[in-house]
């Protein structure tokens, strides 16, 4: 699946510049291409390493240029090699002296197994010496000096694969540098056959294309493309998709093209001769001008493309009528696709006429693996091939190539695939707290292995030996409810990134055990201040059915100072605890539970203030309202936290002695209003309100005045008091 081409310009070396260019056309191979000396074909050649450079005029090509060096440095056999999926594709070629005594008829010769073959060398220099012929450096044949013909031939009546190799010819007094070389390529199979046992019939390769004995595919000559090599490229272009161009002023003149075996080497279409510098004579076209035009309707014979058919006609001789063929085109393929590792179903869509079939559409992975469609359908104008890659992995990232090869031509479109690693948490989730039926879990997605961004998180949980359940979570802290008590649970987190199949493998598993169902909280809990620095918590005696030892855990917290918290363990046979070393005039919250090995259920919270260490402040917002001839409503508010135990309302008639006052003591500090009754009509009273706590009474700043209304006969005198 690699389009490797070696251009030998020129194979006959004189004192002019000569070069080798190796092109990996269309897409970048995984490993770099190399050019080297082919010592297998020719042992005794120069040992100096070649100076291989990048061919800047092409996207992916290497080049060796000899600038009029001594020809001995150049004479020899060469190869260009590219690797796909660890398999080497090697193209061979040769360079020899233009001043050699003999010259080969062709640089390479491809024959089928069993063919009757004549390998020919043309005598260029006449010498009174024997002529000798060697194969791969070993002597095979000599011709006495008086019998050396103008065309020196090696005759192989039944060519076999072992006959393949480099044949050289020279006079006996000559040497490597006066030798002429030609390479015989013998296809493993008889004519028009391919396959491991050569039983499969070849596609008929047109325009001198050669059927590959291992794949059955046509190797098309430079200037032709498509499944059968029927489609001619634009003049001066070559390559499997005709994307490469000869940059010379006369196109591909003086370029000898060498392709993978069994093709060998030839001129581009339109040229012939050992140096490919002779244009085809009239009526001939194709590589080495070996094809003859037989245009049906007297159409023009183009030396590059053959018969140029008029509208409505097609075929090599323009012998077929019908809809003109259209080179396939690849449609709607993005340049870059990001996919998640796992199953991947790339789609390749192509137009053209005839529409590509399933067998004509392939997908080439960066490592050279060729995929065939798994599913295929036609629409009105397109062929759609769906490929299946069961497990695409990050090493599969790189340039993939959608390739379509029909009788109407070939097209390849590379596109970049970036395979992302699915995210997986590196750590198990942390269990912050558990109860008998819940767990509080920290589900941090960081750190994770793989590629982000993280789109979603699933928390998987299960009791050991049961099936997994999951819940989608968004926050980092999550409470898992409705768990079974005293049960081993397993937890893990699955992360997902954007795109289809973005869910990663769940991360490491955390095990935890829910608590047993605890005992109920103590009953009859009461929290009362004991002193300025102590509170007393009491409860009813605790009886349990369990034989386990138990204790009461009391937790107290200051509501003012959040850091002030204390947990006290109280033996289970006690019914109270003194919470001491507290701060005066501070509110505390207290709760209790009964613990065995398992923790019990917490009680509701109780709140209480420690006794005050100062006099209470005066009641505030004192208002006197709803005044009648004998009653009035007094209301007030008190400030929390001063251990106020009672409110005293003191009132007296204006002008009366101080000791003639009446005190009303309200012992429920939560009462905030009181109705004075039994007042005299049309009388002015002075009213004071005090707050009383463990230290004493508050100091009123001033008295409030109240004047009752005139007597009203309707009002019934219910007397004083409450």
């Amino acid at each position: 699946a690699m389009d490797l081409i070696l251009i030998n310009s020129l194979p006959l070396v004189s004192d002019a510049e000569t070069s080798l260019t190796c092109i990996a056309s269309g897409w970048h191979p995984h490993e770099p291409i190399t050019i080297g000396r082919d010592f297998e074909a020719l042992m005794n050649q120069h040992q100096d390493p070649l100076e291989v450079t990048q061919d800047v005029t092409r996207e992916w090509a290497k080049k060796v240029v000899w600038k009029r060096e001594k020809a001995s440095k150049i004479n020899g056999a060469y190869f260009c090699e590219g690797r796909v999926r660890g398999q080497a594709i090697r193209i061979r070629t040769m360079k020899m002296r233009q001043q050699a005594s003999f010259l080969p008829a062709t640089l390479t010769m491809t024959v089928d197994r069993g063919d009757n073959v004549n390998i020919s060398f043309k005598k260029v220099l006449i010498k009174e010496e024997d002529a000798v012929i060697y194969k791969n450096g070993s002597f095979i044949h000599s011709v006495p000096r008086h019998e050396v013909p103008d065309i020196l031939e090696v005759h192989l009546p039944h060519a076999q694969p072992q006959d393949a190799g480099v044949y050289s010819a020279r006079y006996i007094g000559g040497n490597l540098f006066t030798s002429a070389f030609t390479r015989l390529i013998v296809r493993r199979c008889e004519a028009q056959k391919w396959g491991p046992d050569c039983s499969r019939p070849c596609t008929t390769c047109k325009n001198n294309g050669v059927c590959h004995e291992d794949t059955g595919e046509c190797i098309c000559p430079p200037g032709f493309m498509g499944r059968t090599c029927e489609k001619a490229c634009e003049p001066h272009t070559f390559g499997r998709t005709c994307k490469e161009r000869c940059s010379g002023p006369e196109g591909c003149k003086s370029y000898v093209f060498c392709l993978p075996d069994p093709y060998g080497c030839s001129c581009a279409t339109g040229w012939r001769g050992l140096q490919c510098n002779e244009a085809c004579p009239s009526g001939y076209y194709g590589p080495d001008c070996k094809l003859r035009c037989h245009c049906t309707n007297e159409e023009i014979c183009d030396r590059f493309q053959g018969c140029l058919c008029s509208q409505g006609w097609q075929g090599l001789q323009c012998e077929k009528e019908g809809r003109p063929r259209m080179t396939p085109q690849i449609e709607d393929l993005p340049d870059h696709i990001e996919v998640n590792s796992g199953k991947f179903n790339p789609i390749c869509k192509a137009s053209g006429w005839p529409l590509p079939t399933s067998e004509e559409m392939t997908l080439v992975k960066p490592d050279g693996t060729v995929l065939q469609p798994n599913d295929f359908n036609y629409t009105d104008r397109f062929s759609v091939a769906i490929f299946t890659v069961n497990r695409v992995l990050p090493p599969d990232s790189g340039v993939w190539v959608c390739s379509v090869n029909t009788v109407a031509g070939m097209v390849e479109k590379p596109f970049n695939i970036s395979v992302k690693v699915l995210p997986e948490p590196l750590h198990a989730p942390n269990v912050i707290d558990t109860g008998h039926n819940f767990a509080i879990i920290n589900i941090s997605s960081e750190p994770y292995f793989g590629d982000g961004p993280i789109k979603s998180k699933k928390l998987f949980y299960k009791p050991v030996n049961q099936a997994w359940k999951y819940i989608e979570v968004t926050n980092e802290i999550f409470t898992l409810n409705y768990l079974e008590p005293r049960t081993d649970y397993e937890l893990c987190v699955q992360l997902a990134r954007p795109g289809e199949g973005g869910e990663g493998h769940p991360g490491p598993v955390r095990r935890f055990t829910t608590a047993s169902i605890g005992l109920p909280p103590p009953r009859g809990l009461s929290l009362l201040p004991k002193s300025q620095t102590a509170l007393n918590l009491t409860w009813q005696p605790i009886f349990t059915n369990s034989e386990d030892e138990f204790y009461v855990e009391v937790e107290r917290r200051s509501l003012q100072t959040t850091s002030d918290q204390q947990n006290i363990k109280v033996p289970g046979n006690l019914t109270s605890v003194l919470l001491s070393n507290l701060v005066p005039r501070e509110q505390y919250t207290v709760r209790a539970r009964v613990n065995t090995k398992a923790q019990g259920e917490w009680s509701e919270e109780l709140r209480a203030w420690t006794l005050s260490d100062i006099l209470p402040p005066q009641p505030e917002n004192i208002k006197i309202s709803n005044i009648t001839d004998s009653t009035a409503m007094v209301s007030w508010t008190i400030v929390d936290g001063y251990s106020i135990s009672s409110i005293i309302i003191r009132y007296k008639v204006q002008g009366k002695n101080e000791d003639q006052h009446i005190d009303v003591k309200i012992k429920n500090a939560t009462v905030t209003q009181y109705q004075l009754k039994g007042l005299e009509p049309e009388t002015t009273y002075h009213v004071d309100i005090f707050a009383e706590n463990n230290i004493g009474s508050s100091n009123p700043a001033f008295s409030h005045e109240l004047r009752t209304l005139p007597h009203s006969p309707a009002s019934a005198d219910l007397g004083g008091g409450k």
């Epitope: 120069h46 001995s72 000798v132 000599s142 040497n175 540098f177």
Partner: antibody, heavy 122, light 112 residues
């Protein structure tokens, strides 16, 4: 004109060293293997050493092995023979010769230099 | 090493005579193909040797046709069909089958 010109001969004491050179012209020097052949006064020819066109193959006569070194510089079209630990029996005219081959096989020496005399004596 | 033995060590001939020199090797010089790895050289006094025949029977460029080489295996012959004044010299055979390359001791052809 095709020619080989030796230089560097002379009188040297036993155990001494000498370096012979052979300058080539008129042909493509690095197309061919090269050799040194010597001839003791009034005696026959004796092959001394040979070197292939690219110095890939070098061979010596047993009588000089370990003492003489043949080398070539293709960029200068020159062949060399470094002679160490010279003995009286090394006294001879030393010829450089061009092979018709590029390797040391099927040798034939079609071009010879005029020779340079090496005398080893105390 | 391969030993090369020439005979005679010297001979006298008149101009126009047919001269034959033989050379025997201690082992066969016939290679796997039909060529024998043996060369013949001519040396005149005070001059460098000159190649006459290579690979047993192939005349070197510029060598007159009166010189010919023959023989195979271990026995070889250099023949001068009609000796000329310029042919009086010493002739050496040399084997090239294996290194070290070895010469015969020489055959001196003198004017009678």
């Amino acid at each position: 004109e095709v020619q080989l010109v030796e230089s560097g001969g002379g009188l040297v004491q036993p155990g001494g060293s000498l370096r012979l050179s052979c300058a080539a012209s008129g042909f493509t020097f690095d197309d061919y293997a090269m050799h040194w052949v010597r001839q003791a006064p009034g005696k026959g020819l004796e092959w001394v050493a040979g070197i292939s066109w690219n110095s890939g193959s070098i061979v010596y006569a047993d009588s000089v092995k370990g003492r003489f070194t043949i080398s070539r510089d293709n960029s200068k079209n020159t062949l060399y023979l470094q002679m160490n630990s010279l003995r009286a029996e090394d006294t001879a005219v030393y010829y450089c010769a061009k092979d018709i081959r590029e390797q040391l096989v099927e040798d034939a020496f079609d071009i010879w230099g005029q020779g340079t005399l090496v005398t080893v004596s105390s | 090493d391969i030993q090369m033995t020439q005979s005679p060590s010297s001979l006298s001939a008149s101009v126009g005579d047919r001269v034959t020199i033989t050379c025997r090797s201690s082992q066969s010089l016939l290679h796997s193909h039909r060529y024998n790895y043996l060369d013949w050289y001519q040396q005149k006094p005070g001059k460098a040797p000159k190649l006459l025949i290579y690979l047993g029977s192939n005349r070197a460029s510029g060598v007159p046709s009166r010189f010919s080489g023959s023989g195979s295996g271990t026995d070889f012959t250099l023949t001068i069909s009609s000796v000329q004044p310029e042919d009086f010299a010493t002739y050496y055979c040399m084997q090239t089958l294996q290194t070290p390359l070895t010469f015969g001791q020489g055959t001196k052809v003198e004017i009678k």
